[in-house]
Structures are given as structure tokens and as C-alpha cells.
Interface confidence: medium
């Protein structure tokens, strides 16, 4: 904790300027008025404060705004943002995309994924939904940050905005997030022709159900293996060997490379070995000939 001392008269601060870098921590604490600091936050970034001096300045702002900083201060935090914890950021109400841009720029190159995720969350809450301008800002200044949002927040994305999302923005999205985004993408791209539709929907397919994957297998899409590997396990398991062959087209040979990895491994275990042999890839692990497959889940559901 910073010691409380009285400010020597010759050290009194009337302006936030470079002379402050020579103040010891206790002098900064005693001599810098928190309200003056808040009013002149835009100057802080132009002064080479040490890491420890920044701690003191943060402490002063925390005391002045225990319920969370106002946006007028947040917008000008600059590198002081690197001192904020997710708990600090959770108290904020941010609506301006200029504020978001400024802080995303500052966080670049620093290990701040938790803080950035919380900041984006506050922006979505502040603006009421994940609108096109917000998505555009995220894709421009923080590729991949879209996936830091919870499925609940992503559910506020209108389908009309989905077109602004690029494949690389979805690279870090998990299954639950893609579950939310996929139906929106399907709606957004529904009027497109087969090949154009597949190009657009491909990054979202990690959220597709079995029936949609089956439908794609009838459209000669030649799905690449990387996309196939990102499909939900539950969506892949019910597919027949013929459907997977149609779905992958010339890429079907890649199954051999991924033989030991989910969902390919799990899918192989569900297929008859005879059927797998028709692919001519030497895939092993299917159900041997003459075995009867009982689907116990059906019996359990009936009992």
C-alpha cells in the first residue's frame, strides 16, 4: 500500500506534466489530486512514468471512482489500461467505439486476453447488441476477439452483421460459440447459390447439425479436411461412408492422415469395416463383418 504523507508545498501539482516522473511514489500519492488527474488523463500517456508510478495513478483513480471509471476517463487511459484487471473493467460502462479502438491498440502485443475479453463484453452490454459497427471495429483492430465473447453475448448478433465476419475472426471460436453463430450465418447466406454459399458458411460449420452436413454432402462441395475436422463430433458420427466420401470428394484421402484424431477416429469406430474398405484408404477399426449393432440409446429412451 502507498504511504499517506502530506505534500511539501514546493511539490504541489497544478498540472499533469513530465516533471512528475521525478516524484517518488509517496509524493505522487500525496501531491497529485485525483480529480486533476481524471481531468487531464489525456496527458498521462505522453509522460514516461515507470510501472510503479502508474500503480499510484491507478490507485488514485480507483479511490475517486470506486464504482468504476466514467467513459471520459476510460477513453484516455492509454497505457494505464495495461494496469487494469478484468475485475476493474467489469465495473465500466463503455458505449463509444473510439474508446474501444484506443484501448485495443494499447493492448496489442501484451498478454491481456482476459482484459480485452471483458472490455469487449462491456461494450456489447453498453451498446445493447453486437451491431455491425462493433463487429467491424473488432475485425479491424482485434482479429479473433469476437471469439472472446460468451455465447450469450454472441446471441445478440443480428444475422445481417454476419457477412462482416471473416474466417480468421472465427479461428479461436469454440463449439458453443459456433452453435450460436451457425444458425445466424445460415440465415444470412440462405439466398446464395451452392458454391458461393459453401464458401461463406464454411467458417461457421463447427456449429452445423448432422442434417445440414448431410445436405452439403449432396452438393459436390469438396469440403477440405481442416473444415471436416472442425465439425461437431455429434454431427459427424451419423454420416455414412458414402456421405463422407461425397462430402469430401477428392479430399477423402486425408482421412488416413487423421485416422487417429477425433472426429475421424470416432466416426471410423461406428462404420462397418466392409464399408470403410470401399474407400481403399486402409482405414482400420470399423465394426467387423457379421457383428450386430444394437443402438441402446433408443431402447433407453423407450423404457
Amino acid at each position: 500500500d502507498v504511504e499517506r504523507t502530506t505534500c511539501p508545498p514546493e511539490k504541489e501539482v497544478h498540472e499533469i506534466d513530465e516533471s512528475l516522473i521525478f516524484y517518488k511514489k509517496r509524493e505522487l500519492e500525496a501531491c497529485v489530486d485525483a480529480a486533476l488527474l481524471a481531468a487531464q488523463m489525456d496527458r498521462v500517456d505522453a509522460i514516461p512514468f515507470t510501472y510503479e508510478q502508474l500503480d499510484v495513478l491507478k490507485h488514485k483513480l480507483d479511490e475517486l471512482y470506486p464504482q468504476g471509471y466514467p467513459e471520459s476517463v476510460i477513453r484516455h487511459l492509454g497505457h494505464l489500461f495495461l494496469k487494469m484487471s478484468p475485475e476493474d473493467i467489469r465495473k465500466w460502462n463503455v458505449t463509444s467505439l473510439e474508446t474501444l479502438k484506443a484501448l485495443l491498440k494499447v493492448s496489442k502485443g501484451h498478454e491481456m486476453s482476459a482484459q480485452v475479453a471483458t472490455l469487449i463484453d462491456r461494450v456489447v452490454v453498453g451498446r445493447g447488441q453486437l451491431d455491425k459497427d462493433t463487429v467491424d471495429t473488432l475485425t479491424a483492430f482485434c482479429p479473433g476477439c469476437l471469439c472472446s465473447l460468451s455465447p450469450e453475448r454472441l446471441s445478440s448478433v443480428p444475422p445481417s452483421v454476419i457477412g462482416a465476419v471473416r474466417p480468421q475472426d472465427l479461428d479461436t471460436c469454440g463449439p458453443r460459440q459456433l452453435d450460436v453463430l451457425y444458425p445466424k450465418a445460415r440465415l444470412a447466406f440462405q439466398n446464395m447459390s451452392g458454391s458461393e454459399y459453401f464458401v461463406k458458411i464454411r467458417p461457421f460449420l463447427g456449429g452445423a447439425p448432422t442434417e445440414d452436413v448431410k445436405a452439403l454432402s449432396q452438393q459436390n462441395v469438396s469440403m477440405d479436411l481442416a473444415t471436416f475436422m472442425k465439425l461437431r463430433r455429434e454431427a459427424v458420427l451419423p454420416l455414412t461412408v458414402a456421405e463422407v466420401q461425397k462430402l469430401l470428394g477428392p479430399h477423402v484421402e486425408g482421412l488416413k492422415v487423421e485416422e487417429q484424431h477425433s472426429p475421424v477416429r470416432d466416426w471410423i469406430l461406428k462404420q462397418r469395416q466392409d464399408d470403410l474398405d470401399t474407400l481403399g484408404l486402409g482405414l482400420q477399426g470399423g465394426i467387423p463383418n457379421g457383428y450386430l449393432i444394437l443402438d441402446l440409446s433408443v431402447r433407453e429412451a423407450l423404457s
Epitope: 513530465e18 500517456d45 505522453a46 514516461p48 508510478q53 502508474l54 495495461l82 496489442k108
Partner: antibody, heavy 120, light 107 residues
């Protein structure tokens, strides 16, 4: 890869001035503060001052105020240090060193050094 | 100004040794201390920051410890390429100050 390329050795007469340059490459010049450090024979390293390229604002060690002037040219990603009223005491190796002021606060990359010799 | 004292100007060592270089600050600097290595004709290289964090690419035989006023740089298994000058530096407050350096030499 990061590089701080300093200008070559200087031999100057007492009373003259000299301007040393430090060209940054391989990183965003405005994201790091630029420090200058003096290494003289028989003495340790001495911090001269720091400049924030983004704003052009600088701060100096009291000992070097009036002796050193720090400037930057953002367009060429180059930092400069001018030393004036030179005496033999200023003969030393001068380094520029970048400092991500807000992330560890240490001088994580240094230029190769510029040797200054002040002699009549 | 904060004075950083490296009491040993020279230290004799042999390959494989465990070497500890000490540095004392004239007042509390928390963990705002860095260690640098400088070989003849080269510029200083950052080894340790925030008293104990190893900088990217620095071999794990180098470790830093300490807080407040007393700091140690330890080389656990001395190698011939480690023969150099070692400087500590505080960045708790301005002006930034350095220790006078400790030179490692072969016995």
C-alpha cells in the same frame, strides 16, 4: 528482427556539438520509449534521458540537462541525441535502448553503441 | 538518486561453477530491477527483468531473486560464454540508475 542501428564513431573538438542517430526497425517505433545511456571508461552506465516517440516528449537525468537534447523523426523511425559544449568528460560510448515503459520497464534491446571522442 | 551497489568489481570463476552476483539498492525499489550482460565490444543484453523474470531466449541457468533492497543474479552452471560484465539497474524511480558492474573472469 528488432534492430537499433546507431550512427558511426565521432571525433570532435572541444566546444563543438554532435548529433547521434538511432534508427529503429523490426517493430513499431511509436510503441516503445527510447532511452539514451552513457558508458564511460572506468565508470558505470549512466542514464541520460528518455523520449516518447509518439508525442516527442522527453525527460532528462538532471545531470545531463542542458548537455543532451533528445528528438525523434517518426517518419524515418529514428531517434536523435544532440550533445553540445563538448569536453573530454563527454568522451564515451553512447547507447540508445528501447523501453516498453509499461511492460516490465527494462531496456530490452540496445543499439550497438556510438563511440564519441572529444579531443583537440 | 537511488544508488545501486555491486560490491564485487571482479569475480573469479571456473566452468561449471555456481556464481552469485549481488546488488544492493540504497532504498526500497520493490522488484523494479533488471540485470544486463555485456561482453567486450558488444552492447548490453537484458537477462532478467522485474527482479526474477527471465527475458525471452535467456538460458535457464540464469536466475534472478530478491526484492526491496537486496538482489542476486545466479548463474547455476557457469559456461565460458558467460564471461562478461554484469550490471543491475533499478527502474522504481527516476533517474534510472545502474550498478557499477561485476566482471566475471576465469580463475
Amino acid at each position: 528482427e528488432f534492430q537499433l542501428q546507431q550512427s558511426g564513431p565521432e571525433l570532435v573538438k572541444p566546444g563543438a556539438s554532435v548529433k547521434i542517430s538511432c534508427k529503429a526497425s523490426g517493430y513499431s517505433f511509436t510503441d516503445y520509449n527510447m532511452n539514451w545511456v552513457k558508458l564511460s571508461n572506468g565508470k558505470s552506465l549512466e542514464w541520460i534521458g528518455v523520449i516518447i516517440p509518439n508525442y516527442g516528449t522527453s525527460s532528462y537525468n538532471q545531470k545531463f540537462k542542458g548537455k543532451a537534447t533528445l528528438t525523434v523523426d517518426q517518419s524515418s523511425s529514428t531517434a536523435y541525441m544532440q550533445l553540445n559544449s563538448l569536453t573530454s568528460e563527454d568522451s564515451a560510448v553512447y547507447y540508445c535502448a528501447r523501453w516498453d515503459n509499461y511492460y516490465g520497464s527494462s531496456l530490452d534491446y540496445w543499439g550497438q553503441g556510438t563511440t564519441l571522442t572529444v579531443s583537440s | 538518486d537511488i544508488v545501486m551497489t555491486q560490491s564485487q568489481k571482479f569475480m573469479s570463476t571456473t566452468v561449471g561453477d555456481r556464481v552469485s552476483i549481488t546488488c544492493k539498492a540504497s532504498q526500497n525499489v520493490g522488484t523494479a530491477v533488471a540485470w544486463y550482460q555485456q561482453k567486450p565490444g558488444q552492447s548490453p543484453k537484458l537477462l532478467i527483468y522485474s527482479a526474477s523474470n527471465r527475458y525471452t531466449g535467456v538460458p535457464d541457468r540464469f536466475t534472478g531473486s530478491g526484492s526491496g533492497t537486496d538482489f542476486i543474479l545466479t548463474i547455476s552452471n557457469m559456461q565460458s560464454e558467460d564471461l562478461a560484465d554484469y550490471f543491475c539497474q533499478q527502474y522504481s524511480s527516476y533517474p534510472l540508475t545502474f550498478g557499477a558492474g561485476t566482471k566475471l573472469e576465469l580463475k
